[in-house]
């Protein structure tokens, strides 16, 4: 019983109220003690005796200080589609939440009243919006150049492999089949499994970029069921950032070393203004792509030897813009001298392209100490990669204009996996569920 039990019951002063953890008993017209959580009032107070509390019986509880004659009954046992996240004790009710692969279709004050299984997208369709603890999955048809051959609540459309010689063309539900030569995998934004909300899914739990639902999601007319078929294959995504980052870092170091050497030769101080642009991917305007939709400007101090890069996929529909793109420390808008700016933007490569060009430009200003007019100490240019890979509708040699005092160091790189693949969406079929479409 509370500490003030020795003083209760007592008659409150006219117009006064009872103290904390006390209640006013109408019958006794006295302030009496409440019972603590886990107990209930076995005997109510009188003018001469205080409340008598007793522990709650099994499967009953009280969560608050109270004067109820009986404890509350714990909720019924969790159903087979639920998980008991909080057991029934004398002080708290049982809480049931939906087990992995299910979501809460009907919630209650705490926990879930009714769970429903997350629906699966059938072959030819990928997840446009992942299921959450309280919402179902939304599917979309796979865009041209992508496919899904699984029945899954987590798999999104994956890019067709790029064949040197195609034996069987891919379609929405089947990957392309190549002849014996080794194929490469087109890396379309979102060519990964979806991130999964905690406690809603069991299979395919991989933290990966947010889904690319690219132009158009959840369109077309309804269609029907198909036999379940689990399993999927993930695509290589994480190395992309690493490749770009390492490339940027390398080029930055080369540029700095180059300028240091030139400075030693000419005995002129460096103007600490380094600008690194990594990479510049021309947008595929021919397919209505959105181009670099999110550009993150990340700054690093001059002494920093690393560059935080962030790859962003252009997507029109359901995607969590920053959910899986944590901003690097100090990632603020770059301004002023002595900063390295790294901006990345996503674009599409043409469906049949053999590679995505990455234009890496390192601009190094070498300044004269006297009048601050910079002199270009050197200009190096190198081009590598597949010249056929430039997306249609964008200039093949898209150059950043340089002023006379800037040193250009341009490089086009091609990785075995195309950095960014097609984000085209399959236009809607009527009768096709939720077909995605490009902007008109």
């Amino acid at each position: 019983l509370p500490a003030q039990v020795a003083f209760t019951p007592y008659a409150p002063e006219p117009g006064g109220t009872c103290r904390l953890r006390e209640y006013y008993d109408q019958t006794a017209q006295m302030c009496c003690s409440k019972c603590p959580p886990g107990q209930h009032a076995k005997v109510f107070c009188t003018k001469t005796s205080d409340t008598v509390c007793d522990s709650c019986e099994d499967s009953t509880y009280t969560q608050l200080w109270n004067w109820v004659p009986e404890c509350l009954s714990c909720g019924s046992r969790c159903s087979s589609d639920q998980v008991e996240t909080q057991a029934c004790t004398r002080e708290q009710n049982r809480i049931c939440t939906c087990r992995p692969g299910w979501y809460c279709a009907l919630s209650k004050q705490e926990g879930c009243r009714l769970c429903a299984q997350l629906r699966k997208c059938r072959p030819g369709f990928g997840v446009a919006r992942p299921g959450t603890e309280t919402s179902d999955v939304v599917c979309k048809p796979c865009a041209p150049g992508t496919f899904s051959n699984t029945t899954s609540s987590t798999d999104i459309c994956r890019p067709h492999q790029i064949c040197h010689v195609v034996a069987i063309p891919g379609n929405a539900s089947m990957d392309a089949v190549c002849t014996s030569t080794s194929p490469t995998r087109s890396m379309a934004p979102g060519a990964v499994h979806l991130p999964q909300p905690v406690s809603t899914r069991s299979q395919h739990t991989q933290p990966t970029p947010a889904p690319s639902t690219a132009p158009g999601t959840s369109f077309l007319l309804p269609v029907g069921p198909s036999p379940p078929a689990e399993g999927s294959t993930g695509d290589i995504v994480l190395p992309v950032g690493l490749i770009v980052g390492v490339t940027a870092l390398g080029l930055l170091i080369i540029g700095v070393v180059n300028c240091v050497i030139m400075t030693q030769v000419k005995k002129k101080p460096l103007c600490l203004q380094r600008e690194t642009k990594v990479p510049h991917l021309p947008a595929d305007k021919a397919r209505g792509a959105q181009g670099p939709e999110q550009q993150h400007l990340l700054t690093t101090v001059p002494s920093s030897s690393s560059s935080s890069l962030e790859s962003s996929a252009s997507a029109l529909d359901r995607r969590a813009p920053t959910r899986n793109q944590p901003q690097a420390p100090g990632a603020e808008k770059a301004s002023g001298a002595g900063e390295a700016r790294a901006s990345t933007g996503s674009s599409d490569s043409s469906p049949g392209g053999h590679g995505t060009q990455v234009n890496v430009t390192c601009i190094v200003n070498v300044c004269s100490s006297s009048d601050h007019s910079s002199q270009c100490s050197s200009q190096a240019s190198s081009t590598m990669g597949d010249t056929d890979a430039s997306p249609s509708g964008s200039p093949k040699d898209e150059q950043v204009p340089f002023s006379k005092e800037e040193c250009a160091f341009r490089s086009q790189l091609e990785t075995p996996e195309t950095l960014l693949g097609s984000t085209e969406e399959k236009p809607l079929p009527l009768g096709v569920p939720d077909a995605g479409m490009k902007p008109s």
Epitope: R122, T217, L316, D317, G431, P439
Partner: antibody, heavy 121, light 110 residues
């Protein structure tokens, strides 16, 4: 039971405007793309417009682009088609249709019963 | 002028097998799923076939769909008088619009 009920059709003069509505029930409206499809008397089906489940994407047939606007109000479970600058050739039965999102378990393919729009002077 | 080409009419006697064709191109049927709809007089269209050859629940197995290259076909076996209706094929192209065939009016003779 899934139900789609179109309304708002009627007789209108060329150049006039009309707003069609489609009230949806029996399913989670906000999870499905929605379409308008029309059928001129004695003719075939013609797709008119589509709006994505979240209302952020809209696409139109060339024949109605710039004149018709598709929209939805997920809080009211209602699909709309605002038709402006109507022409005689827009005369048709207008159906609202629900996509089923490509689910493996949902065989429901649903159309409303249609509402007749007549454009005549 | 429909992008997907269907014969305007087809006919058969009860019990017969009738096939309705639908011709497109590589950019629509060749690359994507085909859907078939049945429209009985005075009613809204009803999905018969999706994903080229799958039937929604409730559609009799007398109806079957197939696709080869840029063409698709709907076969109706054991023809019945209640099958008399308009049949539409549908697909989609990369130009963002849903495509319908012009429709085939099926007549059950006798």
């Amino acid at each position: 039971e899934v139900q789609l009920l179109e309304s708002g059709g009627g007789l209108v003069q060329p150049g006039g405007s009309l707003r069609l509505s489609c009230a949806a029930s029996g399913f989670t409206f906000s999870a499905y793309g929605m379409h308008w499809v029309r059928q001129a008397p004695g003719k075939g089906l013609e797709w008119v417009a589509v709006v994505s489940y979240d209302g952020r994407e809209k696409h139109y047939a060339d024949s109605v682009k710039g004149r018709f606007t598709i929209s939805r109000d997920n809080s009211k479970n209602t699909l709309y088609l605002q038709m402006n600058s109507l022409r005689a050739e827009d005369t048709a039965v207008y159906y609202c249709a629900r996509s089923d999102g490509g689910y493996d378990s949902d065989s429901g393919y649903y159309w409303g019963q249609g509402t007749l729009v007549t454009v005549s002077s | 002028q429909s992008v997907l080409t269907q014969p305007p009419s087809a006919s058969g006697t009860p019990g017969q097998r009738v096939t309705i064709s639908c011709s497109g191109s590589t950019s629509n049927i060749g690359s994507n799923f085909v859907y078939w709809y049945q429209q009985l007089p005075g009613t809204a269209p009803k999905l018969l076939i999706y994903d080229n050859n799958k039937r929604p629940s409730g559609v009799p197995d007398r109806f079957s769909g197939s696709k080869s290259g840029t063409s698709a076909s709907l076969a109706i076996s054991g023809l019945r008088s209640e099958d008399e209706a308009d049949y539409y094929c549908s697909s989609y192209a990369y130009s963002d619009n849903i495509l319908f065939g012009g429709g085939t009016k099926l007549t059950v003779l006798g």
